[in-house]
């Protein structure tokens, strides 16, 4: 139970003994941490916790082989060797990271917290922190991608695919960055008196950052896609006075605004929660966040159970090549299994992931 | 002003249930930590247990676990403790305690009710 | 549990004596330490906490020191009104336990 007297942490602000050193807690119990914060601590398994960890393993056994399922569909398929479809693989490759962390947490959770020391107690958040942050920056890197082709006018953009790994190493190293800064000093083992509610080892001050960070994320996103989809819409009513298919430019459009919808409405439902709930957390003392923490956590997970299935499953190539592995068929066509497919039924391919395009002439 | 006032019958029969309450003004109830101490006159202070409105979360010391129920209603500010199955060795003075720090749990109290002798006799 | 042991268990001065009254606890609590002080018939009043610091309104001529195991209140010039019951308590977590009381009486 001994005090470790350390240098201050870059970040943290300790609390000073008279010796004016500061008073760290390294080999404290987590019980320590969780008592001081009034967070429960389970001594045994209750109802919730059961239902929470039954439901928690389910839906990390379905992020990963649905994600692992998104990796090999892109990686078989030469037709989705392009950089948008990297981009994609990435992001399954980070949800599929994400299931993996929060299985960790399921064996790590309930009554079982008590057993983690201080640094496998900050290994488990951080494993969740480098996922969930590496699945959002891939999303916005995605919709940038977007941005970009949309404005260029491509089906696909021109970026090589050396830039292309280095957009995913930029996005795997600030993940981990992210997931490492509580362990590496951002933490209240020395400065006990600004310790969390809802995750007793961390600082209030990295609670709002993180929630900060993410909704700031988030916004872009939406102004990204609500740019593209004004811009599109703006093209395709230009577009609808001079040309003889207005009906088939509509529907591209409504497609387009359909899957916006969906992969905004997804990202809000499954993150604005868990997200202002940190925040609450610190500003707002009287409210029972701690009532909720379960199961806006569950929320968040489920984005990534989600991803592969609004990025991919509403590509009707996709879908094929998934049948295609699952059925362990091989494909007579090296290019891909739909090569002559009316490509405008495709939605996502042809709204958020491939621009707008139909067939070979250009809608936007 | 912050206040902490503790309330019930001042006379219990052995093996009934003593039921005290802990009603709070001038600062935001569920924010802080409320915890039950008794002084006797053999033992000095004890430390019952403590319950955490904001969450409902409740700590008792070992001893009284099992017998002492803490629970709190945020609408009417109040505190309550339930001790079942006492004994003249439960006699004393019973206050509630505020917790010193918001939103977290010090485990040392800046605020005390005046305290309520509880006599416990047939 | 933490057991509290404090000494002495009553002490007679004078106005304007320096009294130091002493606590130990039975394992490390860091500065994890209050001190109460009690009139009769009164609730018990918080003095200092995490060892050394003092709550406020409280004057100056009290102070606490310590870490880990051992702790002192000090009163560097007694007065009348200082004259009552001291308890100690440690802060570091439940189950809470408090020292058997130090009175201090006038001589």
């Known amino acids: 139970m001994a005090a470790i007297s350390t240098s201050i942490p870059v970040i943290s602000q300790p609390q000073f003994t008279a010796m004016n050193e500061p008073q760290c807690f390294y080999n404290e119990s987590i019980a320590f941490f969780y008592n001081r914060s009034g967070k429960h601590l389970a001594t045994e398994w209750n109802t919730v916790s059961k239902l929470v960890m039954g439901l928690g393993i389910t839906v990390c056994i379905f992020i990963m082989l649905a994600n692992l399922l998104v990796m090999v569909a892109i990686y078989v398929n030469r037709r989705f060797h392009f950089p948008i479809y990297y981009l994609m693989a990435n992001l399954a490759a980070a949800d599929f990271f994400a299931g993996l962390a929060y299985f960790y947490l399921m064996f790590n959770t309930g009554p079982n917290t008590r057993r983690l020391t201080v640094s496998t107690w900050l290994l488990r958040q951080g494993l969740i922190d480098t996922s969930l942050t590496a699945s959002v920056a891939n999303l916005l890197a995605i919709a940038i991608e977007r941005h970009i082709t949309v404005f260029r006018m491509q089906l696909h953009t021109r970026m090589s695919n050396r830039r292309v790994v280095v957009v995913i190493v930029v996005i795997w190293t600030m993940a981990i960055v992210m997931g490492a800064i509580p362990s590496v000093g951002w933490n209240c083992i020395c400065d006990i008196e600004n310790c969390s509610n809802m995750a007793p080892l961390y600082s209030d001050s990295y609670l709002v950052f993180w929630a900060i960070f993410n909704l700031v994320t988030f916004v872009v996103m939406v102004v990204l896609y609500a740019h593209i989809f004004g811009y599109v819409r703006q093209r395709t009513m230009r577009m609808s006075r001079h040309s003889s298919g207005p009906r088939r430019n509509r529907d591209t459009m409504m497609s387009l605004l359909k899957t916006v919808v969906i992969v905004l409405g997804a990202f809000i439902i499954c993150w604005t929660p868990g997200l202002v709930l940190l925040l609450l957390d610190v500003c707002c003392p009287q409210c029972d966040v701690l009532a909720y923490e379960k199961f806006f956590l569950l929320l968040a997970e489920f984005n990534s159970a989600m991803n592969p299935i609004i990025y991919s499953y509403r590509d009707k190539e996709m879908s094929a090549t998934f049948r295609q592995i699952l059925c362990c068929q091989r494909s007579e066509n090296p290019t891909g299994p739909t090569e002559g497919s009316d490509r405008s039924a495709s939605s996502l391919n042809h709204t958020i992931l491939a621009g707008v395009h139909s067939n070979d002439h250009s809608v936007v | 002003q912050v206040q902490l006032q503790e309330s019930g019958p001042g006379l219990v029969k052995p093996s009934e249930t003593l039921s005290l309450t802990c009603t709070a003004s001038?600062?935001?109830?569920?924010?802080?930590?409320i915890s039950w101490v008794r002084q006797t006159p053999g033992k000095g202070l004890e430390w019952i247990g403590e319950i955490y409105p904001r969450s409902g979360n409740t700590y008792y010391n070992e001893k009284f676990k099992g017998r002492a129920t803490l629970s709190a209603d945020k609408s009417k500010n109040q505190a309550s403790l339930k001790l079942k199955s006492v004994t003249a060795a439960d006699t004393a003075i019973y206050f509630c305690a505020r917790e010193s720090i918001s939103r977290r749990l010090g485990w040392n109290f800046d605020v005390w009710g005046r305290g309520t002798l509880v006599t416990v006799s047939g | 549990d933490i057991q509290m042991t404090q000494t002495p268990s009553s002490l007679s001065a004078s106005v304007g004596d320096r009294v130091t009254i002493t606590c130990r606890a039975s394992?490390?609590?860091?500065?994890?330490l209050a001190w109460y002080q009690q009139k009769p018939g009164e609730a018990p009043k918080r003095v200092v906490y995490?060892?050394?610091t003092l709550t406020e309104g409280v004057p100056s001529r009290f102070s606490g020191s310590g870490s880990g195991t051992d702790f002192t209140l000090t009163i560097s010039s007694l007065q009348p009104e200082d004259f009552a019951t001291y308890y100690c308590?440690?802060?570091?977590?439940?189950?809470?336990?408090f020292g058997q009381g130090t009175k201090l009486e006038i001589k």
């Open positions: 308590q440690h802060h570091y977590g439940p189950p809470l336990t």
């Open positions: 394992e490390n609590i860091y500065s994890f």
């Open positions: 001038g600062y935001t109830f569920t924010s802080y930590g």
């Open positions: 995490n060892a050394k």
